[in-house]
Every structure is written in structure tokens, then in C-alpha cells.
């Protein structure tokens, strides 16, 4: 029986050209994590294998950094990076747990403008 739950950073926004950390955390299970896959829509960004470490997609090698922990850092963000990201925790004996994060990448001016008119 799968008792675990995935906590994520939820819906997040970041500025174009900046960087963001995608984080998931698996709790409420004693299952062993064998591999964590990070996916963007249907594209595999990175793998962290318990024995064999991090592997980054060649398409994202220059913009994706492993960590912190089992998280993923996206750098040099573009508006095209807006969308859903998934962390898939493969565990034994439970199976796979999936967490979802929605990232919105804002134009610099929009982000600044939004910040200027925020209501405290």
C-alpha cells in the first residue's frame, strides 16, 4: 500500500533570465527511493539514481543543475520554460509517486511592474 505523500513548491513564478529551484519532498513512507526523474511535460530533464547519481538531458545540460538535494535548478529562464514540471519518485516497495509544479516565467518588466503595485 502506498502511504507516502509528495510535497512540492506548488505554483511558482520567476523572472526571465533568472533561475529557480524545483523541489519535491517525499514523506510518510519508509520506502527506499531508487530514482527520481524530473520531467517537463513529455520531456525528461534529469535523473537522480540512488547508485549512479545525476544524469542531465543533453538538451538542457547548460541550463539545468542538479540539486539542492533531489531538487533541480533551472537557470537562464525563458518564457518558453513556463509550464508543468513533474518529479517522479521511484521507490521500493511502494512504486512511483508523482509531484507537480507549475512554473510561470515572467518578462522582467512584468515582474518588476507587478512587484511595484503589490498590496501589502
Amino acid at each position: 500500500m502506498m502511504t507516502g505523500t509528495i510535497e512540492t513548491t506548488g505554483n511558482i513564478s520567476a523572472e526571465k533570465g533568472g533561475s529557480i529551484i524545483l523541489q519535491c519532498h517525499l514523506s510518510s513512507t519508509t520506502a527506499q527511493v531508487t530514482q527520481v526523474n524530473w520531467e517537463q511535460q513529455d520531456q525528461l530533464l534529469a535523473i537522480c539514481n540512488a547508485d549512479l547519481g545525476w544524469h542531465i538531458s543533453p538538451s538542457f545540460k547548460d541550463r539545468v543543475a542538479p540539486g539542492p538535494g533531489l531538487g533541480l535548478t533551472l537557470q537562464s529562464l525563458t518564457v518558453n520554460d513556463t509550464g508543468e514540471y513533474f518529479c517522479i519518485y521511484h521507490t521500493y516497495p511502494d512504486g512511483a509517486y508523482t509531484g507537480r509544479i507549475f512554473l510561470e516565467v515572467l518578462e522582467s518588466s512584468v515582474a518588476e511592474h507587478g512587484a511595484r503595485f503589490q498590496i501589502p
Partner: antibody, heavy 117, light 106 residues
């Protein structure tokens, strides 16, 4: 053209060690991890471990953690795999392979290691 | 880790035959499946990656398909140089290979 050229066949006695080399050419050696994979007679391909040539960091599969050592010499664009405390079941063809993202795109020609008393 | 089982383990065929090899995962492979060809005394050669992407330089008679736990490699018209052993490999959970399918001359 990418090439991985391995050292020649070895015959070893049980309890001994063997060191196999893998010389890379045709690409920047430090840009791709090198894996060591073995194939015993009648068995499936089995991953042993990995080295990141850029920083020398190694990763080993649990089964081999205590007996395998992977190293590299960046000046010679060469990776090495040493397996100790050899036993008859280590008789296999040992391959080095370059990993491109998540799968192996180029392999060495293989090195047959025979363990026999 | 996902276990991969290939079928058949041995296959006898003639030049010109259409050949299909199946690779079944113990769990969902999520299309992260690769096919290799290996000839005796030679290194494995990458044929297909991510289920259906043909590696550069590989003849178009090779094709791959599948989803979930079941994947196939098809050779549309077997050529003399295709007699070899074929392996599937997955990286969705762990990095594992199938046991191989040997394609022999009938």
C-alpha cells in the same frame, strides 16, 4: 569519429586483480561520463559503475561497491576499471561505454577477462 | 529497478523476412527505452532511442514502437548483416538491459 579503445584480454587467477583501460578519442573526454558494463557468458549486460572524467567522481552499483575501482587520466583521455578479489564468476567481457544523457551511444570493443586456476 | 524480458530469446529467420522482437518491463518504462544490436566479438551498437527515434546512420528498415510496459523492435526486411543479438535497455527506473534476442539464419 568517436572511439573507445580498450586494452587486451586478460587471464587471472582467483583472488587476483585486473585493471582494464579505455582510451577515448574523437570528442572532449571530460564532457561525458564513462560507464563500465560487463557481460558474463549467457548473462545479460550488467552495469558496474561510472566515472565523471571532469572531476573524477565515481559511482558504483551496490553489487560491486567493495571490489571495483574506476579511475581516469584526463591527460591521456583514458578511463580505468580495476576489479579485485576475482572469482570464476567474474569471467566476462568488460565494456566501457560513453553515456549521452541517459543512454550509451558509443562502446569500447570489449575486454575478455578469464578467471581460472 | 525495472526488469526487462525479451521475447523470443532465439529467432530463426530468412533474408527478406519481417522480424519483430518484444521487450516487456516489470513496470511502466514510460517510453524511455533503447535498442542495441550486437554482433559476435563486437561492441553493442545503438539503433533506436526513446522508443522510436532512429540513431543517425541506422538503416530505415529498423523501427521501434511501444508504450507503458511493452515495446517492439521491427526489422521490415531482414538483411544478411542483421543477423545478430538485440538488446533492449531502459532508464525510467534504474538502468537495466533485457536478456537479448539472437536472430539466426533459418
Amino acid at each position: 569519429e568517436v572511439q573507445l579503445v580498450q586494452s587486451g584480454a586478460e587471464v587471472k587467477k582467483p583472488g587476483a586483480s585486473v585493471k582494464v583501460s579505455c582510451k577515448a578519442s574523437g570528442y572532449t573526454f571530460t564532457e561525458y561520463s564513462i560507464y563500465w558494463v560487463r557481460q558474463a557468458p549467457g548473462q545479460r549486460l550488467e552495469i558496474m559503475g561510472r566515472i565523471d572524467p571532469k572531476n573524477g567522481r565515481t559511482y558504483y552499483v551496490d553489487k560491486f561497491k567493495n571490489r571495483v575501482t574506476i579511475t581516469r587520466d584526463t591527460s591521456a583521455s583514458t578511463a580505468y576499471m580495476e576489479l579485485s578479489s576475482l572469482r570464476s564468476e567474474d569471467t566476462a567481457v568488460y565494456y566501457c561505454a560513453r553515456i549521452y544523457g541517459f543512454y550509451f551511444d558509443f562502446w569500447g570493443q570489449g575486454t575478455l577477462v578469464t578467471v581460472s586456476s | 529497478d525495472i526488469q526487462l524480458t525479451q521475447s523470443p530469446s532465439f529467432l530463426s529467420a530468412s533474408v527478406g523476412d519481417r522480424v519483430t522482437i518484444t521487450c516487456k518491463g516489470s513496470q511502466n518504462v514510460n517510453k524511455y527505452l533503447v535498442w542495441y544490436q550486437q554482433k559476435p566479438g563486437k561492441a553493442p551498437k545503438l539503433l533506436i532511442y526513446n522508443t522510436d527515434n532512429l540513431q543517425s546512420g541506422v538503416p530505415s528498415r529498423f523501427s521501434g514502437s511501444g508504450s507503458g510496459t511493452e515495446y517492439t523492435l521491427t526489422i521490415s526486411s531482414l538483411q544478411p548483416e542483421d543477423f545478430a543479438t538485440y538488446y533492449c535497455y531502459q532508464y525510467n527506473n534504474g538502468f537495466t538491459f533485457g536478456q537479448g534476442t539472437k536472430v539466426e539464419i533459418k
